[in-house]
């Protein structure tokens, strides 16, 4: 039994950022959960990790230096990414794994979402300084 | 006036536990993301562990995930640290900090610290 | 993780000079980059963020330029209390991590 993942086709990050929503055929409150996003086609890269305890806080974290964070839904993970570079426009796609309670589960692999990245459009000017932090 | 003040720390030996608070004042303290950054006796600065906003996610150094615990009351304004299994490496002013929901990572204010020491 | 390397460890100055800190990250790091002073005693404290924009209450002679691996932290006429250490900070890879620091000190 496989767990099936809906992602949008395109997402288009116009400031570096963007937020990726990765929707389950499966409830995933009070469980024990691994959700990650994989760049590329091979998925050879782990982006981001969303560890789930039950409904303890969510552990993130990233091997690979990516900047993000995830919010959880019964049945979704949302994966929240900042800081993203013009070269990491790729394919990227969401992988769910429950540990706890049995009998272990995993996804049939998605159709994938590509993040095109658009960098900032920095204009400087003389006349407009940088913005100021409070 | 934007305002953190941490405390609990002290002196503990290796392989004990430790619960630091930082109250937070002058600001919208749930609608920020709050850090604990630690520096050594005479060394720089490391950060350790992050908190969003509402407190439904975490992000630790590897040097602490698994021993160390961050976690926020917004209904207090504070910030925990909870330290479990303590090192001698440990030993360091913990400071809490401040960022902004754009820039998770960058520190735009500082509480004054508080001194862990770890020794036998 | 990126290591952010800054030279020199220590500058030796006098009041009204110029000081110019050089942090060097492993990898680009784009214009992810603060600058953090930090007094003995005291916390630090934000001066820079995004490479070159000043935080509010920074006064006007200090700049940041840069991009990618290499950026630069001016102070364009020491004041007395400018003495102190400054810390590189990047935020483009996670973890976020600090330089060693240089300390600034009077000559």
């Known amino acids: 039994n496989k767990i099936l993942v809906k992602q949008s086709p395109m997402l288009v990050a116009y400031d570096n950022a963007v937020n990726l929503s990765c929707k389950y055929s499966y409830n995933l409150f009070s469980r024990e959960f691994r959700a990650s996003l994989h760049k590329g086609l091979d998925s050879a890269v782990e982006v981001c990790v969303v560890y789930g305890n039950y409904s303890q806080q969510l552990q993130v974290y990233s091997k690979t230096g990516f900047n993000c964070d995830g919010k959880l839904g019964n049945e979704s993970v949302t994966f929240y990414l900042q800081n993203l570079y013009v070269n990491q426009t790729d394919i990227y796609f969401c992988k769910i794994e429950v540990m706890y309670p049995p009998p272990y589960l995993d996804n049939e692999k998605s159709n994938g979402t590509i993040i095109h990245v658009k960098g900032k459009h920095l204009c400087p000017s003389p006349l407009f300084p940088g913005p100021s932090k409070p | 006036e934007v305002q953190l003040v941490e405390t609990g720390g002290g002196l503990v030996q290796p392989g004990e536990s430790l619960r630091l608070s930082c109250a937070a004042s002058?600001?919208?303290?749930?609608?920020?993301?709050m850090h604990w950054v630690r520096q050594a006796p005479g060394k720089g600065l490391v950060w350790i562990s992050r908190i969003n906003s509402d407190g439904s996610s975490a992000s630790s150094a590897d040097s602490v995930r698994g021993r160390f615990t961050i976690s926020r009351d917004n209904a207090k304004n504070t910030l925990y640290l909870q330290m479990n299994s303590l090192r001698a490496e440990d030993t360091a002013v913990y400071y809490c900090?401040?960022?902004?929901?754009?820039?998770?990572?960058?520190?735009?204010?500082w509480g004054q610290g508080t001194l862990v020491t770890v020794s036998s | 993780e990126i290591v952010l390397t800054q030279s020199p460890a220590t500058l030796s100055l006098s009041p009204g000079e110029r000081a110019t800190l050089s942090c060097r990250a492993s990898q680009s790091v784009s214009n992810y980059l603060a600058w953090y002073q930090q007094k003995p005693g005291q916390a630090p404290r934000l001066l820079i963020y995004?490479?070159?924009n000043r935080a509010t209450g920074i006064p006007a002679r200090f700049s940041g330029s840069g991009s990618g691996t290499d950026f630069t932290l001016t102070i364009s006429s020491l004041e007395p209390e400018d003495f102190a250490v400054y810390y590189c900070q990047q935020r483009g890879n996670w973890p976020p991590t600090f330089g060693q620091g240089t300390k600034v000190e009077i000559k």
């Open positions: 900090a401040r960022s902004d929901s754009s820039s998770w990572y960058e520190f735009e204010y």
């Open positions: 002058g600001f919208s303290f749930s609608s920020n993301w």
């Open positions: 995004d490479t070159s």
